[in-house]
C-alpha cells in the first residue's frame, strides 16, 4: 500500500486483467467477472441512509489514475482501493469508511495494493 499522499497509480499490465465485479458489472462481464486494461477496485461508500455499500469492478486505464486516488468529496464518506498484481485481486481489498470528522475532510491518501 502506498500512503502519504503519493499519487502514483498501480502499474498497468501488458495483458488483460480480470476482476470481480459487484454492483458495477459492465455489459461485457460474465459471471461477475469483468476485464480491463487498467485496474481492479473495491470501494465502500455511504448510501443516502448512511449505510455502507461495497462496490467492486474494473477501471479502464484511462482516467483510473485519478479514480484510484482517494480524493475526499465533501459530505460524502467513501474509500477506494485499486490493485493489479493478479486476476481478481480486488477480492482481497477491504477499504474502510473514513472516520466522521465533523463532516470536515482532510486530503486523503491514495489506497492501492
Amino acid at each position: 500500500k502506498k500512503e502519504d499522499g503519493e499519487s502514483t497509480a498501480p502499474t498497468p499490465r501488458p495483458k488483460v486483467l480480470r476482476c470481480k465485479c459487484h454492483h458495477h458489472c459492465p455489459e461485457d462481464s460474465v459471471n461477475n467477472i469483468c476485464s480491463t486494461d487498467g485496474y481492479c477496485f473495491t470501494m465502500i461508500e455511504e448510501d443516502d441512509s448512511g449505510l455502507p455499500v461495497v462496490t467492486s469492478g474494473c477501471l479502464g486505464l484511462e482516467g483510473s489514475d485519478f479514480q484510484c486516488r482517494d480524493t475526499p468529496i465533501p459530505h460524502q464518506r467513501r474509500s477506494i482501493e485499486c490493485c493489479t498484481e493478479r486476476n481478481e485481486c480486488n477480492k482481497d481489498l477491504h477499504p474502510t469508511l473514513p472516520p466522521l470528522k465533523n463532516r470536515d475532510f482532510v486530503d486523503g491518501p491514495i489506497h492501492h495494493r
Epitope: 488483460v16 461485457d28 476485464s35 493478479r86 486476476n87
Partner: antibody, heavy 116, light 112 residues
C-alpha cells in the same frame, strides 16, 4: 523471436485422456495469457479457454468445461491442456496461442486423432 | 455467445485485384474500456493462423500496408488493395471483447 512449440500429432484411444504441451520461448512467459483453440477439418476455430501463467487463473468456454483442463509449468515456460473422456468429436487440430489483448502468435498445432 | 458472420465464404480474385471481406457481430464489440477488440487472421494452407490486423485497424508487425482494416460497433471490413499470391488462404475475423471469444467461419481467398 516468439515461438510456441507443440508436438505435431497425438494418437489416442476413445475414453482415454491426453495432455498436449506448448513450450513458449522468446518472451517472458508470465507476461501473457495462453489460449487454446480447436479446429476441426474444414471447420472454423473454437476458443477453448485461457490461462494466466502468472497466477494460474483460468477462464473456460462453457462448452469445454469438464472436457479441457489448462495448467502451466512456469519453470519450463510450458502450458498444458488435458482433454478427458475422448471421443471422435475431439479429433481436431489444437493450437496454443499467446494472448495479451488479442492473439498475436500461434503454435503450429497438435493434430489429435481419437481412434480405436 | 457473440456470433461472427463473415461474407463471402469464398472470394475468387485475380492477382493484382482488390479484395474485400466483411464481418458482422451479433452484438457491439466496444468494450467497457472503450477499446474494440476485433481482429483479422490469415490461415495459409497447412499452416496455423497468423495475425494481420488487431483492434479493428492496426496492422501487426511485418504486415504489408496493402491490408486495411476498418469498421466500428458491429460491422467490420478487411480490404486487400492488390492481391498477391502469398495472400491466398482463409481469412478469419475474431473478437476478444466478450467471453467466450469467437471467430468468423472464414473466407477463402482463391485465384479466379
Amino acid at each position: 523471436q516468439v515461438q510456441l512449440l507443440q508436438p505435431g500429432a497425438e494418437l489416442v484411444k476413445p475414453g482415454s485422456s491426453v495432455k498436449v504441451s506448448c513450450k513458449a520461448s522468446g518472451y517472458t512467459f508470465t507476461n501473457y495469457w495462453m489460449q487454446w483453440v480447436k479446429q476441426r477439418p474444414g471447420q472454423g476455430l473454437e476458443w477453448i479457454g485461457e490461462i494466466d501463467p502468472s497466477d494460474t487463473y483460468t477462464l473456460y468456454n462453457q462448452k469445454f468445461k469438464g472436457k479441457a483442463t489448462l495448467t502451466v509449468d512456469t519453470s519450463s515456460s510450458t502450458a498444458y491442456m488435458q482433454l478427458s473422456s475422448l471421443t471422435s468429436e475431439d479429433s481436431a487440430v489444437y493450437y496454443c496461442a499467446r494472448f495479451g489483448y488479442y492473439v498475436d502468435y500461434w503454435g503450429q498445432g497438435t493434430t489429435l486423432t481419437v481412434s480405436s | 455467445d457473440v456470433v461472427m458472420t463473415q461474407t463471402p465464404l469464398s472470394l475468387p480474385v485475380s492477382l493484382g485485384d482488390q479484395a474485400s471481406i466483411s464481418c458482422r457481430s451479433s452484438q457491439s464489440l466496444v468494450h467497457s474500456t472503450g477499446n474494440t477488440y476485433f481482429h483479422w487472421y490469415l490461415q495459409k494452407p497447412g499452416q496455423s493462423p497468423e495475425l494481420l490486423i488487431y483492434k479493428v485497424s492496426n496492422r501487426f508487425s511485418g504486415v504489408p500496408d496493402r491490408f486495411r482494416g476498418s469498421g466500428s460497433g458491429t460491422d467490420f471490413t478487411l480490404k486487400i488493395s492488390r492481391v498477391e499470391a502469398e495472400d491466398l488462404g482463409v481469412y478469419f475475423c475474431s473478437q476478444s471483447t466478450h467471453v467466450p471469444f469467437t471467430f468468423g467461419s472464414g473466407t477463402k481467398l482463391e485465384i479466379k
